[in-house]
């Protein structure tokens, strides 16, 4: 059965692993480009050398491989708050994150921004910030959680969840109106 | 007050192509960083396409790399979404909005302008 050359997985199944099949002729399997490489040749027979050359700078391959070209390195999104971990090698993409004191907030499962870890004012740390998450607060007594900060009571309008945890002030504040009608 | 007011949404047919605006008042346009996010019936908010504050560096989302290319007018105050191929799965409202800079939310956004894409 002639494998589907489409499909470059059912392709390279074919072969054991570390070996890819030749695309004009399946009847070889030619030795994958280790990592830091590409293909620029197949191997001319079984058992010969497949050729793979180093990727160039800007480029990388981090895997074994059998690719045509190299992958171009990722750039540190700057709009983003992004700084650059690590930089691009033949045989790594470059690694970005954030600044100290800041965490990763993922827009998509590949863009991610970065933002000021909470300081909880008018609050306690109740988590502490990581990576990927900002600081879980809790607020003192007086004050409610929006958007992550400790609100004061004051700014809560009847029609927010606020009521609840605000609701003594809020009594209070109703109190001294109607104190203050009479 | 921050405005943005979307426009040039409609029906199109698959495989057509539309052009959105975004104009923007209330802010020094040119100083921030534009987003386009769009949202499906009955789904959630998702990131299309973001662009910085000179144009240069631009983002887009794998659902709609090669057919989608922002870009912006910072004389005329202007963003747009140029979109190309586009296919039944691209009908949303469509939003541009300010980078968020404090927080992980959109705290200026416009009304937005519908997609449909139906043959």
């Known amino acids: 059965l002639v494998p589907h050359l489409g499909d470059r997985e059912k392709r390279d199944s074919v072969c054991p692993q570390g070996k890819y099949i030749h695309p004009q002729n399946n009847s070889i399997c030619c030795t994958k480009c280790h990592k830091g490489t590409y293909l620029y040749n197949d191997c001319p027979g079984p058992g010969q050398d497949t050729d793979c050359r180093e990727c160039e700078s800007g480029s990388f391959t981090a895997s074994e491989n059998h690719l045509r070209h190299c992958l171009s390195c990722s750039k540190c999104r700057k709009e983003m708050g992004q700084v650059e971990i690590s930089s691009c090698t033949v045989d790594r993409d470059t690694v970005c994150g954030c600044r100290k004191n800041q965490y990763r907030h993922y827009w998509s499962e590949n863009l991610f921004q970065c933002f000021n870890c909470s300081l909880c004012l008018n609050g306690t740390v109740h988590l502490s910030c990581q990576e990927k998450q900002n600081t879980v607060c809790t607020c003192h007594a007086g004050f409610f959680l929006r958007e992550n900060e400790c609100v004061s009571c004051s700014n809560c309008k009847k029609s927010l969840e606020c009521t609840k945890l605000c609701l003594p002030q809020i009594e209070n504040v109703k109190g001294t109106e109607d104190s203050g009608t009479t | 007050e921050v405005q943005l007011l979307e426009s040039g949404g409609g029906l199109v047919q698959p495989g057509g192509s539309l052009r959105l605006s975004c104009a923007a008042s209330g802010f020094t346009f040119a100083h921030e960083p534009m987003v386009w996010v769009r949202q499906a019936p009955g789904k959630g908010l998702e990131w299309v396409s973001h662009?910085?504050?000179?144009?240069?560096?631009?983002y887009y989302a794998d659902s709609v790399k090669g057919r989608f290319i922002i870009s912006r007018d910072n004389s005329k105050n202007t963003l747009y979404l140029q979109m190309y191929s586009l296919r039944a799965e691209d009908t949303a409202v469509y939003y541009c909005?300010?980078?968020?800079?404090?927080?992980?939310?959109?705290?200026?956004w416009g009304q937005g302008t519908l997609v449909t894409v139906s043959s």
């Open positions: 662009i910085d504050r000179v144009g240069q560096d631009t």
């Open positions: 909005a300010i980078l968020p800079k404090r927080g992980p939310r959109f705290d200026y």
